[in-house]
Interface confidence: low
Amino acid sequence: RAPRCRELPAQKWWHTGALYRIGDLQAFQGHGAGNLAGLKGRLDYLSSLKVKGLVLGPIHKNQKDDVAQTDLLQIDPNFGSKEDFDSLLQSAKKKSIRVILDLTPNYRGENSWFSTQVDTVATKVKDALEFWLQAGVDGFQVRDIENLKDASSFLAEWQNITKGFSEDRLLIAGTNSSDLQQILSLLESNKDLLLTSSYLSDSGSTGEHTKSLVTQYLNATGNRWCSWSLSQARLLTSFLPAQLLRLYQLMLFTLPGTPVFSYGDEIGLDAAALPGQPMEAPVMLWDESSFPDIPGAVSANMTVKGQSEDPGSLLSLFRRLSDQRSKERSLLHGDFHAFSAGPGLFSYIRHWDQNERFLVVLNFGDVGLSAGLQASDLPASASLPAKADLLLSTQPGREEGSPLELERLKLEPHEGLLLRFPYAA
């Protein structure tokens, strides 16, 4: 008799794929055209990335460091009108893209939370949550919560308002902290909070270090849903050398939780390559004309247009991973088991019941390595086969779809492999 199928977990929309942050509308759209109407025209691009949610803004009125001139219910006229926002929401809904609004109050100022007037600000946030929930947003983000006194209790209250309106609404909190204890204390008092932090921001050194960070985090948070990113707002290139971007894309899309990216991560957007551009929000490179300041500074392969035309580009990899992440049960909500594969490597299995299983092997080092995949670390339910089919490599040159012998696996420097194999009773 066939074994009984495992009961599927309840899946919220943010469990099904990546979130995409557009913190600076003007930088995202470029050419001084950064407004909500223009963003509406970019929704097809977001659809092509198969992201599930757009984290937008802040876009509310905020006069730097002035509480009285900060209105979380009003859209800054530079970004457009409430009608523009409603129109964006409707268009996004049609394309199955959820919209999360960033309500970090003093986003133009020194302290995001006007440290001397916490209660006033907290009331403003509470009012704003109710207002924007009625307007149809799918969730909220608040950043820099390390600057918010009594953050845990405020987050609990805001979470209650958000979930009270609908279980289908999401609250994201962001912190610059990379300290696991601080992160856990924020999560403890807020059951369904999605927290972005700098926890993984210094993980780029070795496979062992990354493995230990990831497994510590997952062990500490138990079975609660988490998010994966390298920071609450910044680009991957702020933390990673170019040669690790593909590896991190593969990892972030295949760890258990919601991957969260900033605009430009999908093309390896790097402020350092664009003289005069701010590190936190460089101009998005749609094509070679997006950065006219220095002729020739932008080549086609740095842009959305150039990379869209190249099946081997970082953008193409992002799209493929995003697609896999959103449709494979084992990647959507499968169990996770990390295991030893040798120095410099981080490897793990994702599996769900009798569905196709996935093996991820990541070489963080700058030398080629042979992977000694020791299944001794793995429970019987997640045992490794002798061979697995190569779904994709972060580096070109391998024949996709071909079976690879796991005992003889060799990885190029900075190469990541995503392999698939069937469930075997």
Epitope: A273, G306, D310
Partner: antibody, heavy 118, light 107 residues
Framework: QIQLVQSGPELKKPGETVKISCKAS????????MNWVKQAPGKGLKWMGW????????TYADDFKGRFAFSLETSASTASLQINNLKNEDTATYFC???????????WGQGTSVTVSS | DIQLTQSPSSLSASLGERVSLTCRAS??????LSWLQQKPDGTIKRLIY???TLDSGVPKRFSGSRSGSDYSLTISSLESEDFADYYC?????????FGGGTKVEIK
């Protein structure tokens, strides 16, 4: 192993049409773009353009717009170059070469010689 | 379009000799440069990509380097199979462009 195998040499008259094929093996053709490169006798290499093997969309260099057409038969893992209304100056060896950004033109076909003569 | 100026256009050298070929880019190409070898029978093989990364299977006597907008291919000790034409290729932007080539002949 990865190979690009091109069709054999062609002798044509001016005004005729030629179609050169390039069969890819050892990898999935849709994962890499395909470039075409011209080399006139005794001369250097000249990029003609490329075809996005995932979408089928061709891009032509300025000097190769009009009489030149790239096509694709994905099921046969084959890319093709067709030259219409042949001229004497089309006499050359034509190469196919696969492409991804950081690994552009890492594998090449052996070349197909096209001679146009009346 | 980005021009690649390759020099010298030809050189004669003896077996075991060290030779260097240069390629200068007319605009910034950020290291997006490859070196190709074309044998007398017409077959083309890529030797180096990203300015200095050796393709797998390419002998270690070949090396690539960059200094500003000048890119070099060095063969540390010429062997008989190295006598061929060498081209540089930029893939920083479209259209892709090649250098004019360097013919390496036996002295």
């Amino acid at each position: 192993q990865i190979q690009l195998v091109q069709s054999g040499p062609e002798l044509k008259k001016p005004g005729e049409t030629v179609k050169i094929s390039c069969k890819a093996s050892g990898y999935s053709i849709t994962n890499f773009g395909m470039n075409w490169v011209k080399q006139a006798p005794g001369k250097g290499l000249k990029w003609m353009g490329w075809v996005n093997t995932y979408t089928g969309e061709p891009t032509y260099a300025d000097d190769f717009k009009g009489r030149f057409a790239f096509s694709l038969e994905t099921s046969a893992s084959t890319a093709s170059l067709q030259i219409n209304n042949l001229k004497n100056e089309d006499t050359a060896t034509y190469f196919c070469t696969r492409s991804v950004i950081t690994y552009t033109m890492d594998y090449w076909g052996q070349g197909t010689s096209v001679t146009v003569s009346s | 379009d980005i021009q690649l100026t390759q020099s010298p256009s030809s050189l004669s050298a003896s077996l075991g000799e060290r030779v260097s070929l240069t390629c200068r880019a007319s605009q910034e190409i950020s290291g997006y440069l490859s070196w190709l070898q074309q044998k007398p029978d017409g077959t083309i093989k890529r030797l180096i990509y990203a300015a200095s990364t050796l393709d797998s299977g390419v002998p270690k006597r070949f090396s690539g380097s960059r200094s500003g907008s000048d890119y070099s291919l060095t063969i540390s000790s010429l062997e008989s199979e190295d006598f061929a034409d060498y081209y540089c290729l930029q893939y920083a932007s479209y259209p892709r462009t090649f250098g004019g080539g360097t013919k390496v002949e036996i002295k």
